[in-house]
Structure formats: C-alpha cells, structure tokens
Interface confidence: medium
C-alpha cells in the first residue's frame, strides 16, 4: 500500500523535511503533490510526468520544493504554514489511480528559560511562593525540577497557566531545593539554571538532649537544646521557671536529687519572630534509671564496620535483654552477646541491620525499655545502572541517560564520556546528538560517606546505518528435551525491528519457537537435534538493514537404542562373527560389548573369527554419551549350528 | 491546434471485424496516453480502451475485453482500434480521445467527432 | 466496478438560472470525477476534472465540487449555450461514465 512517511515527523522551523514515499507502484503515468488531506487543484503543489520528465509547479508551489524521480518530496527552509496535510497522488499505467496522505508538524527552536519569583524569602506555612518559567513560548511544554527530580505529586503544588507557572502553597522547609524548569516541544528542550528557594521556619518545638530524664546523684548534667530553624534559633535555659543563662548548651556537675525539676528550653528567630519552648522533667534518683542505648559507631558502614550496641547504665547483679525489631533476637553469626548481655554487637552490618533496637532492664517487678534505636547503615554504592538500555541511536534524536546506584547516604553522580568528565548530575541530556557522540559514556557514583565509588561503563553508538548484528546465545551445547536455548540479537537499538532466518528462511510455527524482548530474543523450549540449523538475526530501520553471521546450534542428544548390523542372528559354525553396533548420538558415543554378560571390548565393532556353538549366546552393545550423561544398550541373541546341519543359515561375514 | 481524425467505421455483420483508426496532430503525440469512448444511438457515452504512450499499457471495459485491440504507431502519429467479433450491442458512434499530460486525475482533453459503427445482418 | 447515478436524468431551466446536477459514486472515488458537456450531434467537451478544477478555456459559471461519493456541478447563471446533455465521468478503474442530464430550456 501507498504511505508517505515524513522525516522528521515534527521539523525545526528553517530546518528541511523529506516526505518519503513508500510502495511507490511500478509502471507509472506521473504524480503530483497537494497541500491538505485530498486532491485539489487549486492546492497542488508540484506535478511530474514520467514520460516527458516533465515537472509542472502547482498554485501551491513555494519555490522551496523538490520533487525526486521516486515521488519524494523534500521541503526546505520550513516556516511555521507548512505544518499539516500532504497527499501524493499517483497515476499508474493504465491510468488507475493511487493516492496517500502524510503530515508532519512544525515547532521553533526554543531559547534557555529562565525562572522568576513572587518571593524570595517565604515564611513557612504562612507564604504561597509562584515560580514562572520565561519567556513564554506557543506550543511549548514546561516541566519543572526539584533537585533534578520531576515534580512530586502534593496538593500544596499547583501547575497554572499551561504548566509555566509552579505554585508552592504554604511553603515548608522541605521546599527548600534547587528548582529548574524546563521547556520542550518536538524539536528541542532547554532547561534554566538552578533556583534554591530559601525557606524562613521556625523555631520548631526545641528538642533537649540527651532524652535521658533520669539521673543519678552525682552525675554531671550537661543538656543541650536544638530546634530547626532557619536562620538559626537563639537559645534560652530556664530550671523551674527562672532563668539560667542564654546558650545552647546546659551544663550542672555532680547533680543531687535537689537538682530535679522542670528544664525549659526557649528557642527564638529573629527574622520569623515566633518562639518556642520545651520543657523536660529530670529525676535525680539513687536507683537505677530508665535504661537507654549507646553506640559505638553512629554511622556504620555495611560490610565493613562492625558496631556495639551498649543497654546503659550499667549496674550490678542486673539482667539485660536486647529486641530487634520488636522481636526477640534471632539466632545469627553476625549477632554477639558480652558474657553480662550488655553489649551487642553486630558484626560487619548491612543495610537490612537498621534496627530499630531496644534494650531492657529487668527488676523483680517488671522490665523497664529503653528507647529504640536505629542505626544509618551506610552502603553503597551498587553498581550503577543506566538506562535505557538502547545502545545503539540514530543521529538527530536526543540522549536523555539517567543513573541510579542503591547508596546510603545518596550517591553523588559523575558522567565521563570517553573518560572526559562531563557533569556532575544523575542524568545527561545531550539534545539532536550526531555521530560524534559515539563512544564510551560511563557513570560514576560516588558515596561520600563511605568514600567508595563505582562505575558502569556503556558503549553507545550512533549511526544512521546500522551495524552488524551479532548472536549471543544462553547456553551453547544444549541437551535434547531438556534444555531452552535463548538467542539475543546484539546490540539493542532504538526504533529498530529484530527479524531471524532459521537455515535462510522465516521462522517455522512453533509451540517451541516463542519471540519476547521486542523480537530481539528468540527462544527455543525443549530443543530437539532438528534445531540443529543456522540461526541469522536481523535489524532494520527505516535507513538500513543488515544481517549477522549465522549461529550453528550444537544440540547434544542421545544415545539413541543402538542398532547391530547385520541383522542375521543364525550362523554356521567356522564362520567369522563381524557385529558393528551404531547409534545416533552427538557427540558420538562410546561403545562397548558384552557377550553373556561378560564385557568384552570398548570398540564400535565386535569380531570373532570362525566361530563355534560354543558362541552360542546373548551380545549386548552399550553405548554412553558423557556430555548428555545418557546411556542405552540393545541385546541380540546369536545362534551357531554345526556345519551342515541347518539349512539357510549365514556363511558369516 | 489539436486536432483528432476518426475514421473506418461503417456497417458490418454480427461475427464481423473492423478497424478504426484516428489521425492525430496538433500536439506531441508519442507522449500522450489516448483513449477510444463510445456512445450508441440515443444514449450515454461509455469509455471502452486507452493506451500508454509506448504502448507499453492498455486498459480495457469488461464489455470489450478479448474482442477488441487498442494499438498506436508514434510514427504515423496514429491510434487504432482492432474490433473482432462484433455484436448488435456494439453499434455506436465512436471517439478517439485523447488524456492531456498533466492528467490529475485522468481526463480527457480533446475528443475526434467520432465514426459510426454499426453491426447489423 | 464503481457505478456513477447522476441526478436528476432531465432539467428544464431559464436563462440566468442557478442550476445543479448531482452525481453520486457506488463507493469512495476521492477526488477522481470529471464532467463533461456534449451537444446533439457533436462529441463531448471537458468541463471540469479533479472534482473542482476549471478546464482551460472553460468559462468561470462552470464549478464543481465533492469529495468521496458526492459531486456537484453547478451553473451559476445559464447562458443559452448551456443548454446540453452533461456527464459526470470518474477516473478510478474503469473510467465510466454517468448516465447524463438533459439540460432543456423551460
């Protein structure tokens, strides 16, 4: 059937697009081009007579038009009117007519954004902050960026007015991030440099550490108060409602029971004018107080540190219990208890070792919890993953990469293109990419944390043409009805369809053939020694095709029930016994005889000279094929008469 | 000035054979498709053969089809129609014709004043 | 094959009328009809092709349009040469013709 494709689907403006035409028919009279969905003359653009070679512009022929021996017609310096409709029609030889329609759609290439602000220091849950992404741009998409992630889905976050303008309602500290936004139509996509929106909050409710509210006599008593804040909060103490002193820090030595009492922290901002406090009650005791968790390493990392975990306080002829996520420990290698059970330890930690944790102190009455705790394992960075997949892309489109690798904290990323740093971000975007971005594109991930990093490296190629496939296979000796083999053609690509050939031709239909992956892998279930063939994979584009070598599946199979030949089983005596044993296998198997049960030789043919009734008897031949592990045997029973004495019997061999 | 020249109709028995031939000049004729369109007495026109230029392609009506032949020489500038096999039904009055070179869709531009056939016993 | 209805088969009409002829296709022939106009005794005269396309030398109260399986030909003022026999003629496969529309003086 008659189709026009056109290249690009959606063009530049003063870029050129080719209307391609596929299925052109053989023996024709001429065509002609029309703008719109129908012929029209009043509408035509160019028109071609074969014959005369002849090509007569149209009413609607703008001098920026081409027309090829094929019908293809290429429009150059586009401008915005020649978005729409183009019909060829195509009149054949004997005058039967043909017609097809195409389109494309034309777009500006657009300039950086850049972002404005209604506020730049909002109050958090009083001010509404409206970002708007400039300039503004006629069929143009705008997506915003928080930290280079997409938008996360709130109700305090409003896209107005085409999705240019973002809207944060009741901003929180949490909105504090890098916003960028991001203009794209078909033909390109420009991002605007980073906005940081600087949240004022503040003071929350002071948190005074440590929790610990039960002391004993004797003890030093050193509070420290902290409330987020932003700017920072200023500091006030209070015992009992008087004041102490304006510092963030509390600090009572050798306490007695008549340092009980309220503690109150007063935390201040000056640029929000709100003031919070919180108040903590201590109990100075001379008995033990509520128990709570110590650690050795706050910030383990997995595999490589081990950390102790230690139930405070400690006191005497006391029994210590330990939970792990509110279950009782479990039994593990990786878990020590210290003789007294006050410590435990979990050595070289993994990320599943969060906790929470929590200790406890048992008395004659009853057992006293500490608080949890979790533990920030620190780990990573995997092995980063990119995707896509693709490896292969044709010139003109764009390189959108992203990486990910698991990492605690989150791994900061680097991309290297042919071992040149490129940016420092988690995704790369490289727009209308050509050939020369050909190459070696590796991301890093590095965890700052942990120091250690990691890499993946990914070859892209880009090429118009296509290249070479090549087969790769999961298992290259598969056992007869046993074993799958799965073919992939390499390299994945792009808009590309995967075609295969079995010994040069199409698929057969198969219950045991099955194609997944996009067609890219081709799957035999249960195979059999007849797949034993030449597998070829193909990809092709709209620009190219090519084939790759054949692959030759090596199927091992049997050993088959063997055949003895001849087939006679009566001889006469004095004559010669030639018995050859053959079974279908691959590899070929190794054979061997027995005679009476008796084993003979390990050779494929058994030969007795002038034989005797005394070689009377059963002849077994058993073959063996190691690579299938399988054996068979078949048994003959051979009969020798005295000379003379019974007639049609075998003179031998 | 485009002119077409029918001529070799007349009258014929049923089973009969006649050829119409049609004198072109005025335009380039090696190049253009032509066409033969009939029309018996007292009713509508019905298109019947065209040829391509090199006589490479015909095209025929299923009323016509194994009877008739449609041919051209380019150098006597000369369309002509084979009738074999003639019947009652095909008596008409018939016109060469011929399609234009910008022909989108086909048409036909100029027409012959046309010879009458009539097959009668 | 596709079969060609023009209606209506006669017409009487005055000079200075707006006339028109209809002619419906069997199927979808895109914009592939062409009319023509033939008085007694003489051979036809292309009028209009592609549906909507103005012969060279045709005069402009001549006009067509349609697409697909409805076509119209209109005379947007007859002039005493207008009155003829008019066919409609599509150029599919094969290329028949209507059955024709008398135009008559009233």
């Known amino acids: 059937k008659l189709t026009i494709e056109s290249t690009p689907f959606n063009v530049a403006e003063g870029k050129e697009v080719l209307l391609l035409v596929h299925n052109l028919p053989q023996h024709l009279f001429g065509y002609s081009w029309y703008k719109g969905e129908r012929v029209d003359g009043n509408r035509q653009i160019i028109g071609y007579v074969i014959g005369t070679q002849q090509a007569t512009p149209g009413p609607a022929y703008s001098g920026r038009e081409i027309i090829y021996p094929n019908a293809s017609l290429l429009i150059q310096n586009i401008i915005q009117n020649d978005t729409g409709f183009y019909t060829l029609h195509v009149i054949k030889s004997d005058l039967v007519n043909e017609e097809a329609t195409g389109q494309f759609r034309v777009y500006p290439e657009l300039p950086k954004p850049s972002i404005s602000s209604n506020n730049s220091k909002p109050v958090e849950d009083k001010d509404a902050v409206a970002f708007t992404c400039e300039p503004e741009t006629q069929d143009a998409t705008y997506l915003w960026w928080v930290n280079n992630q997409s938008l996360p889905v709130s109700p305090r976050l409003q896209l107005s007015n085409g999705n240019r303008t973002l809207t944060l309602f009741n901003v929180t500290r949490n909105d504090t991030a890098s916003y960028k936004c991001e203009t794209q139509n078909p033909v390109s996509a420009r991002r605007s440099d980073s906005v940081i929106l600087n949240v004022l909050y503040g003071p929350d409710a002071p948190t005074i550490s440590p929790l610990n509210t039960s002391y004993r006599s004797g003890e030093n008593l050193n509070l420290s108060c902290h409330a987020a804040s932003n700017p920072p909060a200023q500091y006030s103490w209070f015992v009992n409602g008087t004041f102490q002193q304006s510092t963030q820090e509390l600090f009572i030595p050798n306490i007695t029971v008549n340092n009980s009492g309220s503690y109150t922290c007063q935390a201040h901002n000056s640029d929000t004018g709100l003031n919070r406090t919180t108040v903590t009650t201590i109990t100075v005791y001379a008995e033990p107080p509520k128990p709570f968790i110590t650690s050795n390493n706050s910030n383990p990392v997995e595999d490589e540190d081990a950390v102790a975990l230690t139930c405070e306080p400690e006191i005497q002829n006391t029994t210590y219990l330990w939970w792990v996520n509110n279950q009782s420990l479990p039994v593990s290698p990786r878990l020590q208890l210290s003789n007294d059970n006050r410590t435990l330890t979990l050595l070289s930690v993994t990320r599943n070792d969060v906790g929470p944790y929590e200790c406890g102190i048992q008395n004659e009455l009853s057992v006293d919890h500490s608080d949890p705790v979790i533990l920030n394992v620190l780990y990573g960075p995997d092995d980063p993953t990119i995707s896509p997949s693709y490896t292969y892309y044709r010139p003109g489109v764009n390189l959108s990469l992203s990486c990910h690798a698991a990492s605690n904290p989150p791994a900061q990323y680097s991309w290297l293109i042919d071992g040149n740093i490129q940016q420092h971000t988690q995704e790369l975007f490289i727009s209308n990419i050509t050939e020369k971005n050909s190459g070696l594109y590796t991301c890093q991930a590095n965890n700052s944390a942990s120091g250690h990093s990691r890499t993946t490296v990914k070859t892209i190629t880009v090429s118009a043409e296509l290249p070479k496939p090549s087969i790769s296979s999961n298992n290259s000796k598969p056992v007869e009805d046993k074993d799958a083999v799965a073919f992939t053609c390499e390299p994945e690509a792009q808009n590309t369809t995967y075609l295969w050939w079995v010994n040069g031709q199409s698929l057969p239909v198969s219950p045991r053939l099955q194609l997944s992956n996009g067609n890219r892998t081709l799957t035999l279930f249960n195979v059999t020694r007849n797949d034993a063939r030449a597998y070829v994979c193909g990809i092709q584009n709209s620009v190219s095709a090519n084939r790759s070598d054949p692959v030759t599946l090596d199927v091992l199979y049997g050993p088959d029930t063997p055949i003895i030949s001849p087939p006679d089983s009566s001889y006469l005596s004095g004559a010669n016994l030639n018995l050859s044993c053959h079974s279908a296998s691959n590899p070929s198997p190794q054979y061997s005889w027995r005679i009476n049960g008796i084993p003979q030789q390990h050779t494929q043919v058994l030969f007795i000279a002038k034989i005797t009734p005394n070689n009377n008897g059963t002849y077994a031949c058993f073959v063996s094929n190691l690579a299938t592990g399988r054996n068979n045997s078949i048994v003959k029973s051979i009969t020798v008469s005295a000379s003379g004495t019974s007639p049609g019997l075998s003179a031998g061999a | 000035e485009v002119q077409l020249l029918e001529s070799g109709g007349g009258l014929v028995q049923p089973g009969g054979s006649l050829r119409l031939s049609c004198a072109a000049s005025?335009?380039?004729?090696?190049?253009?498709?032509m066409g033969w369109v009939r029309q018996a007495p007292g009713k509508g026109l019905e298109w019947v053969s065209s040829i391509g230029s090199g006589s490479y392609s015909t095209s025929y009506a299923d009323s016509v089809k194994g009877r008739f032949t449609i041919s051209r020489d380019n150098s006597k500038n000369t369309l002509y129609l084979q009738m074999n096999s003639l019947r009652a039904e095909d008596t008409a009055v018939y016109y060469c014709?011929?399609?234009?070179?910008?022909?989108?869709?086909?048409?036909?531009?100029?027409w012959g004043q046309g010879t009458l056939v009539t097959v009668s016993s | 094959d596709i079969q060609m209805t023009q209606s209506p088969s006669s017409l009487s009409a005055s000079v200075g009328d707006r006339v028109t002829i209809t002619c419906r296709a069997s199927?979808?022939?895109?914009?592939?009809l062409n009319w023509y106009q033939q008085k007694p005794g003489k051979a036809p005269k292309l009028l209009i092709y592609a549906a909507s396309s103005l012969q060279s030398g045709v005069p402009s109260r001549f006009s067509g349009s349609g697409s697909g399986t409805d076509f119209t030909l209109t005379i947007s003022s007859l002039q005493p040469e207008d009155f003829a026999t008019y066919y409609c003629?599509?150029?599919?496969?094969?290329?028949?013709f209507g059955q024709g529309t008398k135009l008559e003086i009233k």
């Open positions: 005025g335009f380039t004729f090696s190049s253009s498709y």
């Open positions: 003629q599509q150029a599919g496969n094969p290329h028949t």
């Open positions: 199927q979808s022939i895109s914009s592939y």
């Open positions: 014709a011929r399609y234009p070179s910008v022909l989108f869709p086909p048409h036909l531009d100029y």
